[in-house]
């Protein structure tokens, strides 16, 4: 359990201490604390680097001291003969002594308080990165103005993070600019335009100062811009390295500056829109797009009409048109569907004549009726040959989709009637 | 068939055969038969048989049955409650629309009718042709198809002969305009059984094909002259009873 | 007289298979499209498969799209069906009809039998 | 795929009554592709009207069809003993061939 002071004692003091001894003693003092240890008696026997006997004080892994001898106070006033000061709250005492003793040593006396140690100037790193506090057993980190303390509790950075840019244009800087930006911040904002526009970002190089890389060109401040599972950057400099127009492919922009604690420069600036997210002008074969542009955008919306022939079937329903739109992904809808030739289907069977099974019922396949010759003739003209028509029916240049009628050939006998002589 | 020769079926694909009363009919197109009022006035649902040359009972089971769906007699046709005593034969002409239609071939195909033009205007000395299973100079009925080829006579010819078993005064018969007479050569002639068959002429204008100028109607007696129905002069009414009675499937 | 006669039902087991034929007579039977039509026991009528005059023609219900073969034979003046991997639901009466004008039924065969049971 | 929906399933009329057979395509269909078959218990079915208003051979003219587009009627004008049966709609259309409605049984009431 840890203490606020104590006292330490070699073994019998205050008798000779014995032979052949090591004896130690953790001190552990509330965390926040350092300990200062002070000898007030100090008799123990003398040897080169106190190789004989002595009493070690062990700070973590180092070796704070090691004390033989004798010693007395220097000031007349203070019993202390020797004293330790550590900023830790923990310490060990190791007390050893060897197998003989050439005269009666009677060891030390010793006696540790918790002190206060003074974080903000006591270590060699400092634990805050703006203002220190120290108090009675700890310290507190504070910010100037317009900066805020990071969970951490000891660094400081601008609040320059949550905000969120929904309009299609804007502009974004970094805190102060164009003067330096804060120090050891991150900041991060985000925009969110309507699905079916890309964020745009368009930088002007002289638009950009950022402290530069490193030798090994890692950024030691970076801006960088996350759109989905792309990433561009990170960027820094002098003058601004990446492409001037940043085309995101996406509605959703993540910007994420981040500073380290020095080398502060102007920041940058930027300007952003919302660029309708283009699609692409598909190869749609057989067809007509109507309206013709060089470039469709999100909403857009085209009428696809198939040519004289072809049609779109969706369902098992045929149309000579649908439409599609530019989706907010950047994909036509519909896109499954295509022109294809009309079929017009197995032609009709007619009755007293036939028709010769076509190649192919498709879209300009012909095929030819006839009648059951001599008995049938084809009444209603047209000769017989019809087309797979664009509209799906088999039309003939005169009947047009009306079937060929085939009608008795009438007072025609199959053998002349020859009377017989008498 | 007074006079006549044997004939196969395949000379007169368009010879319809009536069983009660044994008569002779004309096929006209899929589903009419033309015929002569006087057959069809006592049975108005009359069995007909197509394509077969003899008309024994064992061939006509395997020859084609006509069904009629309905029969139209000419309205100028006076129907008489004796009609055994008739003296007037004026407009002896019948339609009978078969319930399906006929599917033609060798032995079963119709007869044109005339046209209306001048061209099938018959002179004296045409010859045309007549069939049937009616009475010859050997039996009653005939078992195989007779025919026989006569030519169209001035009316008077058929006037002047005398009747042979008068119902009535020789002056009681009726002659019209819409009647041919025919015959009168060689003892050719049609006879009892012969009504509603045709008289086939050839067409003048397509000599290939023959035309029904007159059916088997009356006649003072067989084996002179006999006289014929002018079809010529019923066609606007054949037309318009077989518009009138169509189906769309035949329109 | 035009008339068709359906054969080649019976009972089969789920994944067998059947071959039905239907012979025409009456008519020109080369000069006409046919069908199979089938009736499940109690239900309505159900088109099958369809195929043109010449035979090189031929559509079938999806649902029977890969199982069923529709065929002819003109020589012979008869109508095919080949069914394979069976289903329960393949039961019914199957007829044959011939394809008329605008593709009416105008004539039916009085239909054959097929069960398919385990 | 085009489905015909007929109405009523059922109707139950007596001799001499007018009954009305609807048949309602689920997309427009041309009425030369719309045909009426009648069947008997036992029987194979029989082409009754074809081209929506066309009466078969041997139909009587007591039965008329009507209709265009999605809407199609049969109806008999005096209900005879030998009518009552099922009647079935079909239609044809070339990119599906042929669909029947589920038929609507005509029973002596």
């Known amino acids: 359990e840890p203490t606020m002071y104590g006292e330490i004692l070699s073994p019998n003091y205050p008798q000779a201490y014995p032979s052949e001894v090591e004896k130690s003693w953790d001190i552990e003092v509330p965390e926040g604390y350092g300990i200062h240890l002070y000898f007030t008696h100090l008799d123990i026997e003398l040897s080169e680097n106190c190789a004989y006997d002595s009493v070690q004080i062990i700070s973590g892994d180092t070796e704070e001291g090691r004390l033989c001898g004798q010693r007395s106070s220097n000031n007349p006033h203070s019993p202390i003969v020797e004293e330790f000061q550590v900023p830790y709250n923990k310490l060990q005492v190791i007390f050893k002594s060897d197998f003989s003793n050439e005269e009666r040593f009677t060891g030390f006396a010793a006696y540790y308080v918790a002190t206060d140690i003074n974080e903000c100037t006591d270590f060699v790193d400092v634990p805050c990165s703006h203002f220190c506090n120290n108090f009675i057993g700890g310290y507190f980190c504070s910010c100037p103005p317009e900066y805020f303390l990071h969970d951490d509790m000891k660094n400081c950075g601008v609040n320059c993070s949550g905000d969120v840019f929904t309009a299609l244009i804007g502009e974004i800087a970094s805190p102060n600019y164009p003067k330096p930006y804060p120090e050891n911040s991150r900041c991060e904002y985000q925009i969110r335009l309507e699905k079916g526009f890309q964020v745009v970002v368009t930088l002007r190089r002289e638009d950009f100062d950022v402290e530069a890389a490193d030798s090994a060109g890692n950024c030691l401040d970076s801006l960088v811009f996350v759109a989905g599972d792309r990433q561009f950057g990170p960027y820094c400099g002098h003058g601004f390295p990446g492409p001037l127009n940043i085309e995101t492919k996406s509605n959703a922009l993540d910007i994420i500056f981040q500073t380290d604690l020095t080398g502060q420069k102007k920041g940058w600036k930027l300007r952003y829109h919302g660029d309708p997210m283009p699609c692409p002008k598909e190869d749609t074969p057989n067809s007509v797009w109507e309206p013709a542009k060089a470039k469709y955008v999100f909403r857009d919306v085209v009428q696809i009409t198939c040519l004289d022939g072809f049609e779109v079937v969706e369902g098992r329903v045929g149309a000579t048109s649908f439409y599609s739109t530019c989706q907010s992904n950047g994909k036509w809808s519909n896109s499954k569907l295509k022109c294809q030739p009309v079929d017009c289907g197995i032609p009709e069977s007619i009755e007293n004549g036939k028709v010769e099974d076509p190649e192919s019922t498709l879209f300009g396949s012909v095929i030819r009726y006839t009648c059951e010759e001599p008995y049938y003739y084809m009444e209603n003209g047209g000769g017989g040959e019809y087309h797979c028509a664009g509209n799906g029916s088999w039309v003939n240049e005169v009947l047009g989709p009306e079937l060929p009628k085939c009608v008795p050939v009438c007072g025609v006998p199959r053998e002349p009637f020859e009377e017989k002589q008498r | 068939i007074i006079g006549g020769s044997d004939a196969d079926i395949k000379n007169f694909p368009w010879q319809v055969f009536f069983d009660n009363p044994w008569a002779g009919g004309a096929l006209i197109n899929e589903y009419w038969v033309l015929t002569a009022a006087h057959v069809v006035e006592g049975n108005r649902e009359p069995t007909m048989y197509v394509g077969s040359t003899s008309v024994q009972t064992s061939r006509l089971a395997k020859s084609k049955m006509l069904t009629p769906e309905h029969v139209f007699i000419h309205p100028g046709w006076k129907l008489l409650e004796v009609p055994e005593g008739r003296t007037n034969f004026d407009n002896d002409i019948a339609l009978v629309r078969l319930k399906d239609p006929v599917k033609m071939g060798p032995t079963v195909s119709p007869i044109c009718l005339p046209g209306t033009s001048s061209d099938y205007n018959l002179m004296d000395g045409d010859l045309g042709l007549i069939s049937g299973w009616g009475r010859t100079e050997k039996r009653d009925r005939a078992v195989r198809l007779k025919a026989a080829r006569l030519p169209v006579a001035p009316l008077r010819k058929c006037k002047e002969v005398k009747v042979e078993k008068p119902t009535a005064d020789a002056e009681a018969y009726v002659f019209t305009p819409n009647m041919i007479c025919a015959g009168g050569e060689k003892g050719m002639d049609s006879c009892k059984g012969d009504s509603g068959g045709a008289f086939a002429v050839q067409d003048p204008n397509d000599k290939t094909k023959f035309y029904a100028a007159g059916l088997v109607s009356w006649g003072p007696q067989c084996g002179t002259y006999g006289l014929y129905t002018r079809v010529k002069n019923y066609v606007d009414w054949i037309m318009k009873t077989m518009q009138e009675n169509s189906t769309p499937r035949e329109d | 007289e035009v008339m068709l006669v359906e054969s080649g039902g019976g009972l089969v087991k789920p994944g067998g298979s059947l071959r039905l034929s239907c012979a025409a007579s009456?008519?020109?039977?080369?000069?006409?499209?046919m069908s199979w039509v089938r009736q499940a026991p109690g239900k309505g009528l159900e088109w099958v498969a369809t195929?043109?005059?010449?035979?090189?023609?031929?559509y079938e219900l999806d649902s029977v799209d890969g199982r069923f073969t529709i065929s002819r034979d003109n020589s012979k003046d008869t109508l095919y069906l080949q069914m394979n991997s069976l289903r329960a639901e393949d039961t019914a009466l199957y007829y044959c009809?011939?394809?008329?004008?605008?593709?009416?039924?105008?004539?039916w065969g009085q239909g054959t039998l097929v069960t398919v049971s385990s | 795929q085009i489905v015909l929906t007929q109405s009523p399933a059922t109707l139950s009329l007596s001799p001499g009554e007018r009954a009305t057979l609807s048949c309602t395509a689920s997309?427009?269909?041309?009425?030369?592709?719309l045909h009426w078959y009648q069947q008997k218990p036992g029987k194979a079915p029989k082409l009754w009207i074809y081209?929506?208003?066309n009466l078969a051979s041997g139909v009587p003219s007591r039965f008329s069809g009507s209709g265009s587009g999605t809407d199609y009627t049969l109806t008999i004008s005096s209900l005879q003993p030998e009518d009552f049966a099922t009647y079935y709609c079909?239609?044809?259309?070339?990119?599906?061939?042929?669909?029947f409605g589920q038929g609507t049984k005509l029973e002596i009431k």
């Open positions: 009809a011939r394809l008329f004008t605008k593709h009416a039924m105008d004539y």
């Open positions: 009456g008519f020109t039977f080369s000069n006409y499209a």
């Open positions: 195929i043109s005059s010449g035979g090189s023609h031929t």
């Open positions: 997309s427009e269909v041309s009425s030369s592709y």
């Open positions: 081209s929506t208003s």
């Open positions: 079909h239609q044809y259309y070339r990119l599906h061939p042929i669909t």
